[in-house]
Interface confidence: medium
């Protein structure tokens, strides 16, 4: 029957950690008496036995889906409107393969096995962009922005890590970007600054490193943008398919970040932007649902230089971790944890 048809592209390519929306429409005439029955749609891996195997995505609420695709593969289209569009977020290598669509409406059940979708997951070649607004003058603070505009909002939010020898603190954080407040010193000229972005949903990391150009001479204002490469569109479908991202304000001074360090002699001073739950009577909050970031640190520091910052973004909790390079924790120091919750 020429009326039984599914239209979807033969193959789609997506970079690891990113996402893609594959448009799809289908048609199957159904017996008139079933016209008011709900339409259920399913995407299965090639070779699946529909009566035994779980689909990778479906709109049927009580239907289990494959564990490895749960929350990442979604039947975004409305099958009652003949839409079988498939969304994939946090693409992983093991997602490589072919998939077929199945529709069920009343007694009509049909698997479109002759028109399958082939998914190709390739290396993440995109790199972060680093934006420096104007010249870097010694002892003057500047906001550097590391962004991944090619990432999509539906995926697991990325983790941004900054590495620099210069004095720094954290500024605004959005789904796609992180701001580093840098106050360079003359000796920081020519040193490296790295922004590393990890996509936890797929476990892939990408980074960009630039050399700081700190000059005494006041120059005309300029903006340097260090763009990610590999943004060619050779058949690669890239992310950003609508959806809601979480925007977080996390202004965190490294010198004053709140952490608890047990020592035999003293406790470090505690300050933080945002709200901090430490529950003094019991120590820092602990829950199996809450990840912790260790604050690797000695009992006190005199400056904010030589640090690595990591900012993670979660549904409710936001974390910062500090690595104080070249400093070993005191032998008698044990580290406890803090949580930074934004309001």
């Amino acid at each position: 029957d020429p009326r039984v048809r599914l239209e979807v592209q033969e193959s789609v390519t997506v970079q690891e950690g990113l996402c893609v929306l594959v448009p799809c429409t289908f048609f199957h005439p159904v017996p008139y008496h079933t016209r008011n029955s709900p339409v259920h749609g399913y995407w299965f891996r090639e070779g699946a036995i529909v009566s035994l195997d779980s689909p990778v995505a479906t709109n049927k609420l009580d239907q289990e889906v494959r564990e490895e695709t749960q929350g990442r593969f979604r039947l975004l289209g409305d099958p009652s409107r003949n839409n079988c569009s498939l969304s994939i977020v946090d693409a992983r290598r093991r997602d490589n393969g072919s998939y077929f669509f199945r529709m069920e409406k009343g007694s009509t059940k049909y698997s479109y096995k002759s028109t399958q979708l082939s998914v190709h997951v390739t290396d993440l070649t995109h790199r972060p962009q680093i934006l420096i607004p104007g010249a870097l003058d010694p002892d003057h603070s500047k906001n550097l922005t590391c962004s991944v505009p090619w990432a999509c909002e539906q995926g697991t939010p990325p983790i941004f890590s900054w590495m620099s020898a210069a004095p720094t603190s954290l500024g605004l954080r959005t789904t796609h970007s992180s701001v580093l407040i840098i106050t360079p010193r003359p000796q920081d000229h020519g040193t490296n600054l790295t922004c590393q972005v990890k996509f936890p949903g797929a476990g892939v990391t990408t980074e960009r490193t630039i050399q700081l150009n700190v000059s005494y001479a006041s120059q005309n204002p300029r903006t340097d943008i260090f763009l990610g490469d590999g943004s060619g569109k050779q058949g690669v479908v890239q992310g950003a398919i609508g959806g809601a991202g979480v925007t977080v304000l996390l202004a965190l001074c490294l010198c004053l970040i709140f952490f608890t360090v047990k020592t035999h002699r003293r406790k470090a001073a505690r300050t933080a932007v945002g709200r901090i739950d430490t529950h003094p009577a019991t120590g820092p909050t602990s829950s199996k649902h809450q990840k912790k970031s260790k604050l690797h640190g000695a009992t006190e520091t005199s400056g904010c230089s030589g640090t690595t910052l990591t900012v993670e973004m979660d549904e409710e909790l936001h974390y910062a971790s500090l690595n104080f390079h070249g400093m070993n924790p005191s032998e008698d120091t044990s580290t406890e944890y803090s949580e930074v919750r934004t309001q």
Partner: antibody
């Protein structure tokens, strides 16, 4: 409640073409086919052809093959029927009808568009 | 194409009468048949599908039967609003209509 709203009456010269529209008001026709059926004055019903908008797939009755073109605009939920090389015997009321199942039943009809072919 | 022949072409009856209209297909069409009612100046109205299934909203005095080549539409007790022209339609092969049966008041 879905309604099929058709364009107004037309008077055409022999040899010319006519294009009649049919808009699904208050709903979509994505899950359906839209057929065109005509009825000459005092005569019975005659099926001309159909389109399945979601597939952009049309097929026609043998009698009208080559003279009728049925199209659809999915964004506006509107179907069109164009009949060319008009002759006086094409004078009729042209109905659009929604086909609601695996076997083509016309469960919803437009009110009809009178096309008069006269020199 | 499959031809559908309705009989009679016209029929006079009174309110309360039981009326039967037949539709014969030139070849077997299983139960792929529908019935429509049309009043003057109006579009046809869908009444019966699958030869015997009543469309929602259609009064139960209407019924359909048959399969293969011979089909009937029965109105058990005619009401004033039932006087109209009735068409059968098949879709087993392409789509064709019967020539219609005009039901008039006696």
């Amino acid at each position: 409640q879905v309604e099929l709203v058709q364009s107004g009456a037309e008077v055409k010269k022999p040899g010319s073409s006519v294009k009649v529209s049919c808009k699904a008001s208050g709903g979509t026709f994505s899950s359906y086919a839209i057929s065109w059926v005509r009825q000459a004055p005092g005569q019975g019903l005659e099926w001309m052809g159909r389109i399945i908008p979601i597939l952009d797939m049309a097929n026609y009755a043998q009698k009208f093959q080559g003279r009728v073109t049925i199209t659809a605009d999915k964004s506006t939920y509107t179907a069109y029927m164009e009949l060319s090389s008009l002759r006086s015997e094409d004078t009729a009321v042209y109905y659009c009808a929604r086909e609601g199942g695996v076997d083509w039943y016309f469960d919803l009809w437009g009110r009809g568009t009178l096309v008069t072919v006269s020199s | 194409d499959i031809q559908l022949t309705q009989s009679p072409s016209s029929l006079s009856a009174s309110v309360g009468d039981r009326v039967t209209i037949t539709c014969r297909a030139s070849q077997g069409i299983s139960s792929a048949l529908a019935w429509y009612q049309q009043k003057p100046g109006k579009a046809p109205k869908f009444m019966i599908y699958d030869a015997s299934s009543l469309e929602s909203g259609v009064p139960s005095r209407f019924s359909g039967s048959g399969s293969g080549t011979d089909f009937t539409l029965t109105i058990s007790s005619l009401q004033p609003e039932d006087f109209a022209t009735y068409y059968c339609q098949q879709f087993n092969s392409s789509i064709t209509f019967g020539q219609g049966t005009k039901l008039e008041i006696k």
